[in-house]
């Protein structure tokens, strides 16, 4: 068979450069006085999502309804992959963590063009919608490096929920400091393959 | 309601050239790679050719490489499908499929065929 | 090139349970999806990734992939279920079709 393709994004080089990668240049971003948030991403980040138990994520979207599948994937099935695009966040976060002079990253999570991962704070949901820039506060999460390669999401609309899995779905999750930070339903696993 | 009509089909002597055209609605085409299927006179369905982004993933059928070219035109919501040095064996109804779901950022057909067209029919005879 | 192997006939009575086998190497490995092909129509999705059902289709069709086999079951089978029914896969991808399975509904 023939085939040819090719995509057009920008990435750091592997996961274990990127934190520190993208520290620098938001600190250069941020002596330089620009303002990050809304306008365009430090850096983008094309990534397969999947959970701390090696489930993969998997979005179904047409155009007028989807559902975001939490599963074992077959092994002959290509992984999905998010555009992952890193801002700086006006606001700290409610837990210290992956930032620079005490702010943090924060992420925007997409899918395919136009559409991006929104919090549902009302319906605790994940949801996905299609916007237009600038993109609206539900849809940028607070990003924390974890331990094991591991993420977490946190809603910047409502510290302390995080993005997390529930009954094999995307579900929002409100986390309890003193007890669950290392809660495993709320850690991922980005993955260039 | 997702629409897709074929066009272009007829007859065309052997070594000959046609090309298709399915024209799509109801939905966002560029969002949704596109594939051709076709079926010759009393026989099974044969992918033949799909498109994901424009232009830069294609993919083809090994009967078919080096003599079709499937293309798309977002801003005209159609998919194309150039066949060239046409051979008898190419005699079918050709339909234009497009995929159940968006594309992902991974790339590549994202399968299955969750809409058809009506199909147009291509007769290759001298 | 992959090969998917179906039954070229099956028969059954009204009311009764129909199933159409896809046979491919590792076929488990991989999604499945089956269309239904009424005569002079064009194919029909009926079931994809292996199980699911688009909307519209009754829930009379359903769906299960393992091993080498993938399975495609009608119960209480109707009159406006006779049809040809193909089984695909997607493999690196490029689409692949079984051959073709004809219900004839007695």
């Known amino acids: 068979m023939h085939h040819h393709h090719h995509h057009h994004h920008h990435h750091a080089a592997g996961l274990n450069d990127i934190f520190e990668a993208q520290k620098i240049e938001w600190h250069e971003a941020a002596i330089e006085g620009r303002s990050i948030t809304g306008i365009s991403p430090i850096t983008e980040y094309l990534a397969s999502l999947s959970t701390y138990n090696d489930q993969s994520i998997t979005f179904a979207l047409e155009d007028e309804s989807y559902e975001i599948y939490v599963e074992d994937l077959k092994k002959d099935k290509k992984k999905d992959k998010v555009l992952l695009s890193y801002y700086e966040s006006q606001h700290p976060s409610s837990e210290s963590g992956d930032g620079v002079d005490g702010k943090m990253l924060m992420v925007t999570l997409s899918p395919t063009k136009d559409f991006w991962l929104q919090a549902n704070n009302k319906e605790h949901s994940v949801e996905l919608h299609k916007c237009e820039k600038p993109l609206p506060d539900q849809a940028f999460f607070v990003l924390h490096n974890r331990s094991f390669n591991c993420v977490s999401f946190e809603c910047k609309t409502d510290p302390g929920v995080f993005i997390g899995v529930k009954d094999n779905h995307l579900a929002l999750i409100k986390v309890d400091y003193s007890e669950n930070l290392g809660s495993e339903n709320i850690l991922f696993k980005l993955s260039e393959i | 309601e997702v629409q897709l009509l074929e066009s272009g089909g007829g007859l065309v002597q052997p070594g000959g050239s046609l090309r298709l055209s399915c024209a799509a609605s109801?939905?966002?085409?560029?969002?949704?790679?596109m594939s051709w299927v076709r079926q010759a006179p009393g026989k099974g369905l044969e992918w033949v050719s799909g498109i994901a982004d424009d232009f830069t993933s294609t993919y083809y059928a090994d009967p078919v490489k080096g003599r079709f070219t499937i293309s798309r035109d977002n801003s005209k919501n159609t998919l194309y499908l150039q066949m060239n040095s046409l051979r008898a064996e190419d005699t079918a109804v050709y339909y234009c499929?497009?995929?159940?779901?968006?594309?992902?950022?991974?790339?590549?057909?994202?399968?299955?065929?969750?809409?058809w067209g009506q199909g147009t029919t291509v007769t290759v005879s001298s | 090139s992959y090969v998917l192997t179906q039954p070229p006939s099956v028969s059954v009575s009204p009311g009764q349970t129909a199933s159409i086998t896809c046979s491919g190497e590792r076929m488990g490995d991989k999604y499945a999806a089956w269309y239904q092909q009424k005569p002079g129509q064009s194919p029909v999705l009926v079931i994809y990734?292996?199980?699911k059902r688009p909307s519209g289709i009754p829930e009379r069709f359903s769906g299960s992939n393992s091993g080498n086999t993938a399975t495609l079951t009608i119960s209480g089978t109707q009159a406006i279920d006779e049809a040809d029914y193909y089984c695909g896969v997607l493999k690196q991808d490029t689409g692949v079709f079984g051959g073709g399975t004809k219900v004839t509904v007695l």
């Open positions: 499929a497009r995929d159940l779901w968006m594309m992902n950022y991974a790339g590549g057909l994202r399968y299955p065929f969750g809409y």
């Open positions: 109801g939905f966002t085409f560029s969002s949704y790679a």
């Open positions: 990734r292996d199980t």
